[in-house]
Each structure stands twice: as C-alpha cells, then as structure tokens.
C-alpha cells in the first residue's frame, strides 16, 4: 500500500493483498475491503459491471464469468483493485463477439483469459486460414488481444483467440471484424444535369448523387447567395462494403422567373468537401432566336451551289420548320438537326442546299420556325451572278448603233472601233446614250443595259465592237463597215 501523510486520506486495503488472484472453478472467491470509509465493491469484465455495498465480496461457487477486476472504493473516491482469474478448463476465454475497428486505429478483440498461465495467447484465422501478413497484434490476458492499425482489407475477417492449454491449442468462439472506414478522400458528387431552362409554372427537379465510403457523409442543396432551406427528398443505398450512394433530389413544383440562379449540391466528410452546381433559368414564355451562319445577302455564280445555313435557339423545342421560295415550300434539299445530342440542348441547325443555281433562281429564300409559344423567320436575298448576254445589236434608222445586254451584276457596255481588217479593236468610242432598262423591275433578275453610239462618226472601213462585261465575264458583238465611194454599205452585225 502507498504511504501517506497522517490526516491525508488513503486508498482502501484489500485482503488478500495481491494484484492478481487465481481461483479454481467451483471454489470460493472471498475478498475483504479494509477501510473505515468503505463505500462499495465494483466488478468489471467486458461490458458488464456489478456493485456490492458490503465490504466483503463473497462468491461461493466461482464460475469463469466471475473472472475480472474487483475494485473497492472509499468515501474519498480512492480505490484499490485486485484481478481475479477463475480457472475453468472448459471455458478458457470470456468473449464479447462484437468486434469493430476504425481504419488506421487499434481495436480490441475482447477475449480475456480465465487462466493467465496458458501459453501462446494469440489470434488465428478461421478454418485454418492464415491471418493477413501485415496484421500485428498485442495480447493482454486481462483485456484481450489488440489488433494494431486496422486496415480496410481486414473487413469481415474471421478470427479466433487462441491459446495453448496443457499442450493443446484452444480456440475461442469466432469473431468477425467490422472495419469502419476512415474518410480518405472527399465525397464524389455529380448532378443529373448542369443546366435547366424552364418556362414559368413548370416543375424544376434536379438530382445530386453523393458517393462515399459510408453513410455518415453530410450533404445538402444550397442556393447560391441565399440561406433559404430548400425542399429535398433523399434515397440511399449500399452497393457493398465502403460503397454508399445517396441521391438528393431538389424540387420546385412551380418555378418562377425569380427562382433562376445557381444551385449547389454540397457534401462533406472528415477529409474535406466537394460540390457541384446546376444552373436554372426560368423564362416567362418560350423563345426562338435565329442566327444566320452566312450573310443574309448572298451572291452566287450561275451554275454554282450555295448552302443557306442558320443556327437557332428554340425553347421549348421547335415543332415546325420550313424553307420557302416564291411562296413555294421546299420538300427536300434541306435538313434540320440539333446542334448537340445533349439533353439540355436548345440550339439547332437548318441548312438549305441550293445546287447549280440558274440566273432565274435568284430571290428571297425564307426560313420559318415555330414552337408552342412563338414563330420566327429569317430571309436570305440570293443574287445569281450571270455573265452578260447580248440581247440585241442593231443599226437603227437614225444611224445609231445600239447594243442591249443583260446580266448580273449590271453589265457595262464599252464600244471599240477597229480600222480596216485589224482584229484588235483598241480605239474606244464614247457612247451617245446609256440606259438601264429594268432598274425599277423585280430586284433579283438580270439587269438590262442599253448603249448607243453614232455610226456617222466612222469614215473608214472597219469593225465596231460592242463589249458587255461584269464581274462574271464578258461577251462581244461586232458591226462591219464597208464604204463604196462616198456611200456607206450595209452594216453587218455579228457576234
């Protein structure tokens, strides 16, 4: 017993004055607590606790389950203990079969011995299976066997406590180790869709999936820049060991424009946090916005192809699309498709394929699209560039030479005189009169230009060239002059 100063309270004395006592099964346990201020005896083994208010603890016929720590406490709260082993050949271990271990922590296999004099007190795998190579343990006859630094791989490991008693190996009841995983990563969070577009009054519902090693992960939906508690519904399940999944579904039954914003699904565990967001846009009504992918004024050469392409945003989804020319609807030559296969896609593409365009096929081509809320359209003005064509070239009765040419863009007519038999007409002749004949006519056809020169200006034999040209090409017509004496012969026009 410890020595103390006079007047200072001291712990009680126990008889027999030993720290440990071994009693055979069936024999008596008699423990005496000597203290003027005796309060109680306490017995502890595994999770069991018993009390006795008498200063002498007597168990007439000791059983293995009487093995444990007996503590005597006095009125000053001071105590002394003795550990009693009740040796029972038929019951070497006391067991509490519940066995949990927190990952990376130590855990106790509770199989205290009833006989401290056995040897090889250790752990063994069930059915002769070896224990994991890295499993380390420390035996303590009074408490059990401590597994050091529990690994996740030990989950559901089947174990026995084992000891050699009189040369024979004795096994306890089996233990199944349940490992409580440590959080070693942030939760994995994902959302059903990254963005939502709705009309007022429609239901907004979005699901966040949270995955972690256990259900003790915390999760919630939050509205950015708002503290309002959102209405959530949950489902959860275990896909197996350390594979827990929760679905948190956020619902706004009738969305309003002011519900628009960013919603965050937030999850955290002891390792850290993770989040994912979804964006809600609520519009008061649907819309269609059309974006031409080429200029709406199109110039194309005669015989060539052109594709009229639009992209458009439509919400709700488009119901009718058509391409129109001169009040006629195209049944083919066009295609319409979504810009992406994404579920939340609202962008579409429409293409009209015009092939080998003729000069007569210029005009306004209109794309029309509608959904349940709105209609929209866009027009393309298509001009077909054509090489000039000389429609007429005549000598008029008044002696004028006249050339009429048609084409697009508007042709320019130049006049040249070639003296004698020269083929090269280099000397230009200024026209007397130039007119655009159909400037006020339909806007997309060929433009007709008329140009005249005075033939009386020519005094020698030769050829007059009327040359019509534009950006696409050129065409010429010729007038031949022949003089006989002072008389001008008939002029022969040719191209």
């Amino acid at each position: 017993q410890p020595s103390v100063s006079p007047g200072e309270p001291s712990p009680p004395s126990i008889h027999p004055a030993k720290s440990e006592l071994i009693v055979r099964v069936g024999n008596e346990i008699r423990l005496l607590c000597i203290d003027p201020g005796f309060v109680k005896w306490t017995f502890e083994i595994l999770d069991e606790t018993n009390e006795n208010k008498q200063n002498e603890w007597i168990t007439e016929k000791a059983e293995a389950t009487n093995t444990g720590k007996y503590t005597c406490t006095n009125k000053h709260g001071l105590s002394s203990s003795i550990y009693v082993f009740v040796r029972d050949p038929a019951k070497l271990f006391l067991v509490d079969r519940s066995l949990y271990g927190k990952e990376d922590n130590d855990t106790l296999v509770r199989c205290p011995l009833t006989d401290p004099e056995v040897t090889s007190y250790s752990l063994k795998g069930c059915q002769g299976k070896p224990l994991p190579k890295d499993l380390r343990f420390v035996p303590d006859p009074k408490a059990g066997i401590t597994i050091k630094s529990v690994k996740r791989a030990y989950h559901r490991l089947c174990l026995h406590c084992s000891a050699d008693q009189e040369g024979k190996s004795v096994l306890s009841d089996k233990f199944i180790l349940k490992v409580r995983p440590a959080f070693k990563a942030v939760p994995v969070v994902s959302v059903s869709k990254a963005s939502y577009l709705l009309r007022e009054g429609e239901e907004f519902t979005v699901t966040c999936t949270i995955k972690d090693v256990s259900s003790s992960v915390y999760s919630t939906w939050k509205r950015e820049n708002s503290q309002t508690k959102l209405q959530e519904k949950y489902n959860s399940w275990h896909h197996g060991d350390f594979n827990y999944e929760r679905q948190a579904t956020l619902t706004i039954s009738s969305a309003r424009v002011n519900d628009s914003g960013v919603f965050m699904c937030y999850a955290n565990n002891t390792f850290g946090s993770a989040n994912v967001t979804t964006t809600l846009e609520v519009v008061d009504k649907g819309f269609i916005n059309i974006f031409p992918m080429i200029n709406t004024t199109v110039f194309v050469n005669d015989g060539e192809n052109v594709d009229l392409i639009v992209e458009y945003e439509a919400f709700p989804k488009p119901e009718h699309q058509q391409w129109i020319y001169m009040n006629r609807t195209f049944t083919d030559k066009w295609e319409d498709y979504p810009k992406s296969e994404n579920e939340s896609n609202i962008r579409y593409v429409s293409e009209l394929h015009l092939t080998r365009l003729k000069g007569t096929e210029g005009g306004t081509y209109t794309f029309l699209v509608s959904n349940s809320d709105v209609n929209a359209s866009i027009a393309f003005n298509v001009y077909v560039n054509t090489k000039p064509e000389i429609l007429t070239y005549d000598r008029l009765v008044n002696g004028m030479l006249q050339c009429v040419a048609a084409g697009f863009p508007e042709p320019t007519i130049d006049w040249y005189f070639c003296p004698g038999t020269e083929q090269r007409c280099s000397a230009s002749v200024l026209p007397v009169d130039v007119q655009t004949l159909n400037a006020s006519g339909p806007p997309f056809g060929k433009l007709v230009v008329q140009s005249s020169i005075d033939s009386s200006a020519f005094k020698h034999n030769g050829t007059v060239e009327c040359k019509a040209y534009n950006d696409v090409g050129k065409t010429s017509a010729y007038f031949n002059f022949a003089f006989k004496g002072n008389n001008k012969e008939q002029i022969h026009p040719h191209t």
């Epitope: 949990y100 349940k178 259900s215 003790s216 929760r246």
Partner: antibody, heavy 119, light 107 residues
Amino acid sequence: EVQLLESGGGLVQPGGSLRLSCAASGFTFSDYPMSWVRQAPGKGLEWVSAIGGSGGDTYYADSVKGRFTISRDNSKNTLYLQMNSLRAEDTAVYYCARGAYDGEGFDYWGQGTLVTVSS
Amino acid sequence: DIQMTQSPSSLSASVGDRVTITCRASQTISGYLNWYQQKPGKAPKLLIYDASTLQRGVPSRFSGSGSGTDFTLTISSLQPEDFATYYCQQNYRTPFTFGGGTKVEIK
C-alpha cells in the same frame, strides 16, 4: 446505458396534426442516424422515416411522404416526427429507433407511444 | 420499393426444437439484412445484423445466413423465452422495409 423515450402520442381526429418526440441519452446522439418505426394494432412493423446524424438527409416511406416530417435537435438530443393530415390508417404504436452503423439495423428502441386517429 | 417476404407466417414448435425462418427480398440486398425479435407489448430487439452477425448479448443459439435475396434465421435449440414474433428487415436501400413477421408459438 442507451435510452430512448418517446412522447407526444394521443388521440387525434382525421386531418389533424401531432408531434412526437424521442429523448435520447447514453450515447453521442449526433453520431447516429435515427428512425421512426410504427406498428398498427395486431399488425407487423412498418418503417416510417429516417434521418442522418447531422440532420442533413431525411427519408420517408411512400405512405407518409408529404405528410410527415422528421427532424432532430442534436443540441437537445431529441428526435421529432411532425405528423400532419393524419388518417385512420396512421393509428399505431410509434417507436423511435437508433440506426446502427451502415446497414447494421436498429440496435436500440424506445418503448413506443400510441397514436390513435379517430373521429 | 424492395418487398420482404417471410415464411412461414407462423409455426408451432417445442422447447429444444430447431427452428428455421426464411426471408426473401424482391431484389438483391447483398448482405444488408437484419433480424428482430418482438414479444407482446414490447419493443423489437435486434438479434442479427449484416445477415449473419450476432448482436451483442444475443445467445449463440441464434444464427443467420444468406446473401442476395434469400436469408435464413435459425434457432438451434428453442428455449421458452424464444416464443415471440420474428421480423426480417432490409437496410440495403431506402425506403427500408420489414417482412410480415413469423410468430413462433408453443406446440
């Protein structure tokens, strides 16, 4: 020692409301999910609702969804069940139960409180 | 929802008998099955969790087995205090569901 004590049961008319409480002691309340389980007279057990340790996640049986709300106050070690729009078929003994670790069942139960819905 | 079907709904047995109760899930629940014992006028008591793990303080005459959809509770030698109603329950996914119960009566 783990203890769960329900209160708040009684007689209520159809369409009425009632709030059950469950006072917990003997363990770290916020570490455990909690559930309500009910048993109609002479019938089997029916799980009603559950709530995670932090109170963040809540779960309901289809039969009570939209009418019952589970909540907890970890500072008071108390679990609640707010029951609205009560029906005759909600008549039962309501038990509060502690959820053990992931999927390991309800390891501690209260003694139950009787809710009678009748006109 | 996952349906849990217990059979039989009741059985008569004598002290010392070996009793077997089965529980079938409508879809796989891995090993997330629990067994409870309930005596008249009392709250249920957890016997077995994780299909086969005995809850602390439960006598070793009780055992559980099974995985996936089919599970069994066995009482190796029925004792007078074992006459009660037994329920299985899945904790695999919400909503959690109980079987209809099996009443074990004295023959």
